[in-house]
């Protein structure tokens, strides 16, 4: 049911990266509007986009409010010029998004090479830690802060000189490792949830060799 | 069910080439690390090399290097292991395994049921 | 490359017997050591993970500890279905490496 000329939205889809939140659907509008809402499980409805003409709605605010609650969200389907009309049940058409747990399904963003630094045959990686929108105390809190020794680092090493790819893990943002003297090597690193069982692993940093710019060698 | 079938083995010639198919189902092998390992005849376990499929790196023994490629398709969900100038060293059971991580700790939690590659004239 | 020493190489025991097999790294290896069991014609069975977590499915009576690079599995009282070949094998660098298998016999 639903008032003439106005569709319900369709294929609400949730797209996150590092808990930025932001709901999707279809179709561009024509002669309509539309208004989104978001709820926890046993919370109230928040309405939010109120009469867009956008098919998307950035729900990154309420989400980080805690991002272990699973959240629903629902869009409001409204004829443009006349957003008081319902449909003839009495209330506007609207469609419900799947389910949605930041902590677990948030995509890991790209994570990046903060610096390495060589002292003899050891190399130190380390891994810039992302800020994320997530805030305790006032503070945005960081990608670790948030998941604390759920997330772990791989890194993916190897000479300049081949191809095979060495790897390494962290639970930190630090990795130390062994190279060969004498060598260059390159860096990559992917964040990972091994908890997870969707979106566990990010893609991979920008590549970083050493004899570039962020690293620094010392001969002990 | 979470499952690897391995296919492809059988007798080849030395210097020959056989691509070995490691099917996975109940999984998505890009969430995962794949790695193949081998069994010589009344021999211990040898590993001989891995592939993250979401990003495609890979290494391998040093006995393999240069011979052994691994790959993968994520639209079959199977990995790869293509192998070429067998010697007869390279006669064995042929197991992938998959990967996973407790904290940064890897763990091979669940392996194919192997498949023979004979090498010999 | 690290490599892992397995001992005993072989060993016989009786039903009901404790069993360890140890494995040393040559050099540090954190906690990133695993164990295996392998049966005749049959794929490794990954029993013990971190040194000491005993995975999903596996009878209490087989237990991992750590000593520094000293690894241990134990099987406190031996089945029939525990006679089997086990190996211990390192994850903590690349290329990972196994032991070279400890060969469970009935006496």
């Known amino acids: 049911s639903g008032t003439t000329n106005t569709v319900a939205a369709y294929n609400l889809t949730w797209k996150s990266t590092n808990f930025k939140t932001i709901l999707e659907w279809e179709p561009k509008p024509v002669n309509q509007v539309y208004t989104v809402q978001i709820s926890t499980k046993s919370g109230d409805w928040k309405s939010k986009c109120f009469y867009t003409t956008d098919t998307e709605c950035d729900l990154t605010d309420e989400i980080v409010k805690d991002v272990k609650q699973t959240y629903l969200a629902r869009v409001f389907s409204y004829p443009a010029g006349n957003v008081e009309s319902t449909g003839s049940a009495g209330e506007p058409l609207y469609e419900n998004s799947p389910e949605f747990t930041p902590y677990l399904e948030t995509n890991l963003g790209q994570p990046t090479i903060q610096s390495f630094e060589q002292v003899g045959t050891k190399v130190n990686v380390t891994v810039e830690d992302e800020r994320t929108l997530v805030r305790r105390n006032n503070t945005f809190l960081s990608l670790r802060d948030v998941f604390g020794k759920d997330l772990i680092y791989t890194l993916y090493y190897w000479k300049s000189s081949s191809s095979g790819k060495k790897t390494a893990k962290t639970n930190t943002n630090e990795f130390l490792i062994d190279v060969d003297k004498g060598e260059n090597y390159c860096f990559s690193v992917q964040a990972v949830i091994p908890s997870r069982t969707v979106n566990r692993k990010s893609t991979d940093s920008p590549v970083e060799c050493m004899g570039q710019e962020k690293g620094e060698f010392r001969e002990i | 069910e979470v499952q690897l079938v391995e296919s492809g083995g059988g007798l080849v010639q030395p210097g020959g080439s056989l691509r070995l198919s490691c099917a996975a189902s109940g999984f998505t092998i890009p969430s995962y690390w794949i790695h193949w390992v081998r069994q010589a005849p009344g021999k211990g376990l040898e590993w001989v090399g891995y592939?993250?499929?979401?990003?495609?790196?890979?290494y391998y023994a040093d006995s393999v290097k240069g011979r052994f490629t691994i790959s993968a398709d994520t639209s079959k969900n199977t990995a790869y292991l293509q192998m070429n100038s067998l010697r007869a060293e390279d006669t064995a059971v042929y197991y992938c395994?998959?990967?996973?991580?407790?904290?940064?700790?890897?763990?091979?939690?669940?392996w194919g049921q192997g498949t023979l590659v004979t090498v010999s004239s | 490359d690290i490599q892992m020493t397995q001992s005993p190489s072989s060993l016989s025991a009786s039903v009901g017997d404790r069993v360890t097999i140890t494995c040393r790294a040559s050099?540090?290896?954190?906690?990133?050591v695993a164990w295996y069991q392998q049966k005749p014609g049959k794929a490794p069975k990954l029993l013990i993970y971190s040194a000491s977590f005993l995975y999903s499915g596996v009878p209490s009576r087989f237990s991992g500890s750590r000593s520094g690079t000293d690894f241990t599995l134990t099987i406190s009282s031996l089945q029939p279905e525990d006679f089997a070949t086990y190996y211990c094998?390192?994850?903590?660098?690349?290329?990972?490496?196994f032991g070279q298998g400890t060969k469970v016999e009935i006496k």
């Open positions: 050099q540090d290896v954190n906690t990133a």
């Open positions: 592939i993250d499929p979401y990003n495609g790196a890979t």
């Open positions: 094998q390192q994850h903590y660098t690349t290329p990972p490496t």
């Open positions: 395994a998959r990967a996973d991580y407790h904290g940064v700790d890897e763990y091979w939690d669940y």
